[in-house]
């Protein structure tokens, strides 16, 4: 059946609508569109003749209509007057007519609404407020939003006037929110700007902060008053009933016992005309002295000296407290407190014990802290490190060595070559070196305060020829699918290229192989048994090259699932049963057997002479690799037939 679908059905003014034709008959002569529910020549919009593939505008054509060859009609720039019915008249080749009618409705695009209010400053628990959504629009739906949420259910909220008016009875401060109204029709929805309801309230009973009521003589008294109020409250302070000042904060410096008494804060709201007061009682006590720390050793030596820190002055019936690095004391056998907690002893100090240390005296009101004390722990020197780490140099380059040792006070450095003192500096520089500069380079670090010295020796070889390199490994027996191995080519030499070979071939491309450290280090991730190969590293510079001896990687793996041979599972009574178990494993696994769950011997081969049907059952071989910590097993069923029968052998 011929039908017309309007897309969309509800159209906004200025937009477009498509009258879509469904089930258009075959073999047409042509078709025409008419405004209205019937065919009326005076209201023809458009005609289309199939034979000429040409359309003709009718009297009702406005220039905004476009007809498509599939008979659908597009109307653009829709106006209000376009609302209504449209009839398609189809003339078939047999001159039999068919008609279908469709319709759409036109709605205006809504303007942005606004909110008017009958009371801009309602008073809490007293006034009502009526919000009205403007303008009044026909065929529009009105919605309200509070803080971008739909209206809550409340007996104090009432909608009226077709939801255009929202009334809040007996407003509270919680009604201070963002209110929006929304107008909707089938083609548009618009929201107003927010209106913030300004509810006048308070003042509530004021709160005085801080809450503590006990103070020490000499402190500053700083009281702040706050009362919930809109508009903000005006504040007044009274001490023992006597007016002091009209401020939110009351400040009295350097108080004495005489400042003890009752302190009253009064809050006043000029718009509501209400007053509220709160009273707090302040007590001022005489002040104890500020503590300080004394030490029996201001420059203790690491791992040698103990230090006793004492909290002064000594006061009877007083609790002493200690802090290290702004934390309470950690539990440590090297920290000891005296019975009265006044003395803290550090046994065998380390460089990490520098502090800062604070002690405190607990009194009735608070804790008085000392100034922090920092220990000057003498330590070192540690073993010096010589950088850079190169040991091979080419003739003609400059040799620049730097020495560093952790030390307090900082170490003094000396350099020796082959035991002969050179200079007393942290850095050693020799320009344009030759083979004669090869030798033992010693850095000596000396701590003048502790009297300790430490040395480090480095062998420097100056040669145009590179040495034969060697490979060091961080893991001599890696486990398959678990470990990584890092090979490093030694020595580290300046201006040198590092190369690697596996089984005499250059490195294969693999995501499990990674070169780093200037190609000096070759890392194999997640090693497999196939990585058990010969690895060679090579070094080369512009004048020479050399290769290391091969290092074979010993990968621990397995045991894999064992195999029991022979594969036969059926035997004749009286035969010998000789089962051998094998599992791929490195190192070789330990073997054990179970028959029907009962442990047998710990051998690779299980031998039973002259078997009978009593030997029927499950034969399990267990393998265990102690190095990888992995186990595996396999079970085989054996059937023994009486010698009179002739069973078919099965694998």
């Amino acid at each position: 059946k011929l039908t017309i679908e309007s897309t969309p059905f509800n159209v906004a003014e200025g937009k477009e609508v498509l009258l879509l034709v469904h089930n258009l008959p075959q073999h047409l002569f042509g078709y025409s569109w008419y405004k209205g529910e019937r065919v009326d020549g005076n209201r023809q919009i458009i005609g289309y003749v199939i034979g000429t593939q040409q359309a003709t505008p009718g009297p009702a054509y406005s220039g905004r209509e476009i007809i498509y060859p599939n008979a659908s009609l597009l109307i653009q720039n829709i106006i209000q007057n376009d609302t209504g019915f449209y009839t398609l008249h189809v003339i078939k080749s047999d001159l039999v007519n068919e008609e279908a009618t469709g319709q759409f409705r036109v709605y205006p695009e809504l303007p942005k609404p606004s909110i008017s209010s009958n009371n801009s400053k309602p008073v809490e628990d007293k006034d009502a407020v009526a919000f009205t959504c403007e303008p009044e629009t026909q065929d529009a739906t009105y919605l309200w939003w509070v803080n971008n949420q739909s209206l809550p259910v409340s007996p104090r909220l009432q909608l009226s006037n077709g939801n255009r008016t929202l009334t809040l009875f007996n407003v509270t401060r919680n009604d201070t929110a963002s209110y929006k109204c929304e107008t909707q029709n089938p083609v548009s929805a618009r929201r107003s700007d927010s209106v913030i309801l300004n509810v006048l309230y308070g003042p509530d009973a004021p709160t005085i902060s801080p809450l503590n009521t006990s103070y020490r003589s000499g402190e500053n008294l700083n009281l702040s008053c706050h009362a919930a109020s809109n508009p903000p409250a005006q504040y007044s302070w009274f001490v023992n009933g006597t007016f002091q000042q009209s401020t939110q904060e009351l400040f009295i410096p350097n108080i004495t016992v005489n400042n003890s008494g009752s302190y009253t804060c009064q809050a006043h709201n000029s718009d509501t005309g209400l007053n509220r007061t709160t009273v707090t009682t302040i007590t001022v006590y005489a002040e104890p002295p500020k503590p300080f720390i004394t030490s029996n050793n201001s420059n203790p030596v690491e791992d040698e000296d103990a230090v006793a820190l004492t909290c002064e002055p000594e006061i009877q019936n007083t609790t002493y407290l200690w802090w290290v690095n702004n934390q309470s004391l950690p539990v440590s056998p090297r920290l000891q407190l005296s019975n009265d907690n006044r003395t803290l002893t550090l046994l065998s100090v380390t460089r990490n014990d520098v502090g800062p240390y604070e002690c405190g005296i607990q009194n009735k009101l608070s804790v008085d802290h000392s100034d922090p004390v920092i220990l000057n722990v003498l330590y070192g020197p540690d073993d010096p490190t010589i950088s850079p780490s190169y040991t091979y140099y080419r003739p003609g380059v400059n040799l620049s060595l730097s020495c560093h040792a952790a030390s307090n006070p900082p170490a003094q450095y000396s350099w020796l070559i082959d035991g002969n003192i050179q200079q007393h500096t942290q850095e050693l520089f020799i320009s344009n070196i030759t083979e004669k500069n090869s030798g033992l380079y010693t850095c000596q670090a000396n701590n003048s305060a502790s009297g300790h010295s430490r040395t480090t020796v480095k062998t420097i070889t100056v040669s145009a020829e590179l040495p034969k390199p060697s490979i060091s490994s961080n893991n001599s027996k890696p486990v398959e699918d678990k470990d990584a191995v890092a090979f490093t080519c030694e020595p580290e030499a300046q201006n040198t290229t590092y190369l690697w070979w596996v089984n005499g071939q250059s490195l294969p491309v693999s995501p499990r192989l990674q070169l780093s450290n200037g190609n000096r280090t070759l890392t194999l991730f997640n090693v497999t048994r196939n990585d058990a190969r010969a690895y060679v590293c090579g070094i080369q510079n512009s004048v020479s090259a050399n290769r290391s001896d091969p290092v074979t990687l010993d990968v621990l793996y397995g045991p894999d699932t064992p195999i029991i041979s022979p594969p036969d599972s059926s035997y004749l009574s009286g035969a010998n049963l000789n089962l051998s178990c094998h599992s791929a494993s490195n190192p070789s696994p330990q073997y054990s057997w179970r028959i029907n769950g009962i442990p047998q011997q710990h051998t690779q081969v299980l031998f039973i002479a002259k078997i009978t049907p009593n030997n029927n059952g499950t034969y399990a071989c267990f393998v265990s690799n102690l190095a990888t910590g992995r186990n595996n097993s396999i079970v085989k069923s054996i059937t023994v037939s009486a010698s009179g029968t002739s069973p078919g052998l099965s694998a």
Epitope: I50, G51, T52, Q53, T56, P69
Partner: antibody, heavy 118, light 113 residues
């Protein structure tokens, strides 16, 4: 966008045949009629006729019957003009032009020059 | 058949000046029932296909500069270029699509004086 692309220039001898193609893109070929227009060198536009792309029915203008054939291959969205027994006076630029739904011609192909010379 | 006659055959106008081309169908191309004139104007520049400028005798095609305008009804039509530009040099054709066979005018060549 809606576009008509015609085949390239042709040089033919008298008595030969030529087939000019017009490929439509950006719309469905069968929705709009296709006109053919001739323009002889230095001359005006001469309407040769049109083909109803929906039914395949051709209409030829006076003077363009017999040797001129309009055809379609809707599977490749292409209209064709075939001229047989070419004469030197058939030398011209041949245009295909889509018949707009109201009857005017828009757009036009870029034209195909057919030169008939012995 | 409707015969279309254009005048003049050629026209030379100074840049910025008005150019006027006339077109006379041998019979009316006004369809009374919708009051539409079935006449179009085309512009053809050298080496290019014709381009639709105006349809329904006076409706400018989108993208056509507003210095081009069409007027007239029945059997008398005019294409006007209000201020000639260098790029307007072309041959201009009128065409009726009122009845089959549709027909073109012989063309008017517009040049710059």
């Amino acid at each position: 966008q809606v576009q008509l692309v015609q085949s390239g220039s042709e040089l033919k001898k008298p008595g030969a045949s030529v087939k000019v193609s017009c490929k439509a893109s950006g719309y469905t070929l069968t929705d709009y009629g296709m006109n053919w227009v001739r323009q002889a060198p230095g001359q005006g536009l001469q309407w040769m006729g049109w083909i109803n792309t929906n039914t395949g029915n051709p209409t030829y203008a006076q003077g363009f019957t017999g040797r001129f054939v309009f055809s379609l291959d809707t599977s490749v969205s292409t209209a064709y003009l075939q001229i047989s027994s070419l004469k030197t006076e058939d030398t011209a630029v041949y245009y295909c032009a889509r018949k707009a739904i109201w009857g005017w011609f828009d757009p036009w192909g870029q034209g195909t020059l057919v030169t008939v010379s012995s | 058949d409707i015969v279309m006659t254009q005048s003049p055959d050629s026209l030379a106008v100074s840049l910025g000046e008005r150019a006027t081309i006339n077109c006379k169908p041998s019979q009316s191309v006004l369809y009374r029932s919708n009051n539409k004139n079935y006449l179009a104007w085309y512009q053809q520049k050298p080496g290019q296909p014709p381009k639709l400028l105006i349809h329904w005798a006076s409706t400018r095609e989108s993208g056509v500069p507003d210095r081009f305008s069409g007027s007239g009804s029945g059997t008398d039509f005019t294409l006007t270029i209000s201020s000639l530009q260098a790029e307007d040099v072309a041959v201009y054709y009128c065409q009726q699509y009122y009845s089959t066979p549709c027909s073109f005018g012989q063309g008017t060549k517009l040049e710059i004086k």
